[in-house]
Interface confidence: medium
């Protein structure tokens, strides 16, 4: 229903603490370069307005839309033109175009240093000195690096961060307590950021229908006991939630997400018995818990899908009368029976089923035409199953680091035009599929692998869209959301690529590499490996293995030498020459 003051309504609904957090995230995601203090000032102004409007809904500016309130604050910044350049041009537009313009300028790879974690003592001191400012900085730093982070989830991660600090800052060895816990939290939050980025890309690039289909499949797998209309209801509400968050409407998004969690908990008997473990928790934990629930058991005695979707005499009638309903029901029925399939595979099956009906229902004998439709799914199922089998075998054989390197070589050969930092980032992420999924039992491997790869490849698509350099990447990213992974898998080495000129500087190491943390040292080596492949795209795996082995030996030797810099100066050029000889 319409409220006299939207800002007062949202302040009352989400409460002051979450309101402040969501407003801070909103500004940080729009204005990624501003210092924290500038954001804190804007947040205070908006919060003061909200409080005034709660006291008197007819006070000045209380009838403004949230976009007007946020947009006017942004456009009043004196430093806007200097800091953000053409973002200032957005201010000449009226809502809703102004907000669309701000969204268009969100930067998925802002030029910001990596979020560095201070020493345990420093962290704990800052936490104890000013808790509010400490978590304000956390929200700001994460949000500006991840302009599509799912805002209510970021509030949840801030809460978890607080719980970890509360526990570990009292521990005898603060560092030993904090490091593993914060590493795990950071890992989860990075995956969460990438997952929401995929949802936003689905909605923005392929429309609501694409996300609705994705959500219908995933929720049917998770809640197979719920009936179709219940799943549809949740899908509709969830789509609204993510549309709002992806559109920068974070207060509405958090409010609607809380309403959906409440609805699901009120109807748990018709949705899933698993919900009870979530429903007594406070709102942020409740919603996070529901999102993370394991699939319910598939109900016993379900009839074969063929009964309703192949053998029934009314298949074409049902399809032609209400396509969305019938195809939605097909996806629901197939998905609730297949928690062992990935969401994208199930969506491919839905697409294949729809194409078959479209063709067959126009023939004289539709039934004869579509009778074998479910059998025709087999190649679509076999392809990702084989991919999982081959890659998990390779991972088990090579281990984490070398599996990443194998993917680094594979993807550099496929799309050598892509920038080296992007190839390193994407290949490292793709490589993590091994440790993340290959240890799972057979029935859980396929959904884990393929749905994770969809998230990682979306990151490639998003980064590539910012600076497009490869027609192949553009094609795989834009043609079909569900076929992205098979499209990339099917790419062979790019035979049109002109090898990169050799640059000795790229392969010159210095003593500073010895003091880098292990992860950063690996990234340096992997950067050199990508450059090597770009220089010699036809190098064999054995040749590359030899060169990488020699590089590793050089690092080991020089990093344990008395005079490290001298060692690199002498041994480095020798290695470059021997590598050239190895690679021909």
């Amino acid at each position: 229903e319409a409220h006299k003051s939207e800002i007062a309504h949202r302040f009352n609904d989400v409460g002051e603490e979450h309101f402040i957090g969501l407003v801070l995230i909103t500004f940080s995601q729009y204005l990624q370069k501003c210092p924290y203090e500038e954001h804190a000032k804007l947040v205070k102004e908006v919060t003061d307005l909200a409080k005034a409007c709660v006291a008197d809904e007819s006070a000045a500016n209380c009838d403004k839309s949230l976009h007007d309130i946020f947009g006017d604050k942004i456009c009043a910044l004196p430093s806007l033109r200097d800091t953000y350049g053409d973002v200032a041009d957005c201010c000449e537009k009226k809502e809703p175009e102004r907000n669309e313009c701000f969204l268009h300028h969100k930067d998925d790879k802002p030029d910001l240093p990596p979020f560095a974690r201070p020493e345990a003592d420093v962290l704990c001191k800052a936490f104890h000195d000013d808790e509010k400012a400490f978590f304000g900085h956390y929200l700001y730093e994460v949000a500006r690096r991840h302009p599509y982070f799912y805002a209510p989830e970021l509030l949840y991660y801030a809460q978890k961060y607080k719980a970890i600090l509360t526990e570990c800052c009292e521990a005898a060895d603060k560092g030993a307590c904090l490091t593993p816990k914060l590493d795990a939290l950071e890992g989860k939050s990075l995956i969460s950021a990438a997952q929401e980025r995929l949802r936003c890309a689905s909605i923005q690039k392929f429309g609501d229908r694409a996300y609705k289909a994705w959500a219908l499949v995933r929720l049917s797998q998770r809640f197979p006991k719920a009936d179709f209309t219940d799943i549809s209801k949740i899908v509709t509400d969830l789509t609204k939630v993510h549309k709002e968050c992806c559109h920068g409407d974070l207060l509405e998004c958090a409010d609607d997400r809380a309403d959906l969690a409440k609805y699901m908990c009120e109807h748990q008997e018709t949705i899933s018995s698993h919900l009870k473990e979530c429903c007594d928790k406070p709102i942020l934990e409740k919603a996070h818990c529901i999102y993370g629930l394991h699939n319910d058991e598939t109900p016993a005695g379900l009839p074969a899908v063929a009964e309703e979707f192949v053998e029934d005499k009314d298949v074409c009638k049902n399809y032609e009368e209400a396509k969305d309903l019938f195809l939605g029901k097909f996806l629901y029925e197939y998905s609730r029976r297949h928690p062992d399939y990935s969401v994208v595979l199930l969506l491919r099956l839905g697409k294949a089923y729809e194409a078959t009906l479209k063709k067959c229902c126009a023939t004289d004998d539709p039934h004869a035409c579509y009778a074998k439709v479910l059998d025709e799914f087999q190649p679509l199922v076999d392809e990702p199953k084989n991919l999982v089998k081959q890659n998990c075998e390779l991972y088990e054989q090579l281990g984490d680091y070398n599996f990443q390197n194998a993917l680094l070589v594979r993807y550099t050969k496929k799309v050598p035009q892509v920038s080296t930092p992007t190839l390193v980032e994407i290949s490292r992420s793709l490589g993590k599929v091994g440790s993340k999924c290959c240890k799972h039992p057979e029935a859980e491997r396929l959904p884990c692998v393929e749905d994770y790869l969809s998230v990682v490849l979306n990151r490639l698509c998003v980064l590539h869209e910012k600076t497009p350099v490869s027609e192949k990447v553009t094609k795989c990213c834009s043609e079909s959301l569900v076929d992205r992974r098979p499209c990339f898998s099917a790419l062979g080495p790019d035979e049109t690529y002109v090898p990169k000129e050799f640059n000795a500087e790229t392969f010159t190491f210095h003593a500073d590499i010895c003091t880098l943390p292990e992860t950063e040292r690996k990234i340096k080596k992997q950067t050199a490996l990508v450059e090597l492949v770009k220089h010699k795209p036809h190098a064999t795996n054995d040749q590359l293995k030899t060169v990488v082995g020699e590089f590793t030996a050089l690092l080991d030797k020089c990093c344990s030498a008395e005079d490290k810099e001298a060692c690199f100066a002498v041994e480095g050029p020798k290695l470059v020459e021997s590598s050239k000889a190895t690679l021909g």
Partner: nanobody
């Protein structure tokens, strides 16, 4: 015993509007998804629209999208169908029914209300 009683049908000119109602009893209406189906003279049953127990989402047959609106009032145990821009091909007996939990079939429907679109 489940009872569904449709009303609101009648004769209307092309381009006109009608609002059908369906009073439900004998089951928990507010936990049941409902639908409207229709049967044109000499034809089989045709889906028209479906509504979830909470009021959203809704589904419409392609032939009525943008012209018909399904709604419900759970406090009155009543289902509605607002029909605008009526066409001759909308002439049919309209039935309300409980949405099936499994097959695209349904267990209960009323006696129907006749809608005739003619000039």
């Amino acid at each position: 015993e489940v009872q569904l009683l449709e009303s609101g049908g009648g004769l209307v000119q092309p381009g006109g509007s009608l609002r059908l109602s369906c009073a439900a009893s004998g089951f928990t209406f507010d936990t049941s998804s409902m639908l409207w189906v229709r049967q044109a003279p000499g034809k089989g049953l045709e889906w028209v629209s479906v509504i979830h127990q909470s009021g959203t989402p809704t589904y419409y047959a392609d032939s009525v999208k943008g012209r018909f609106t399904i709604s419900r009032d759970n406090s009155k145990n009543t289902l509605y169908l607002q029909m605008n821009s009526l066409r001759a091909e909308d002439t049919a007996v309209y039935y309300c029914a409980k949405f099936p939990s499994s097959r695209m079939k349904f267990d209960y429907w009323g006696q129907g209300t006749l809608v005739t679109v003619s000039s």
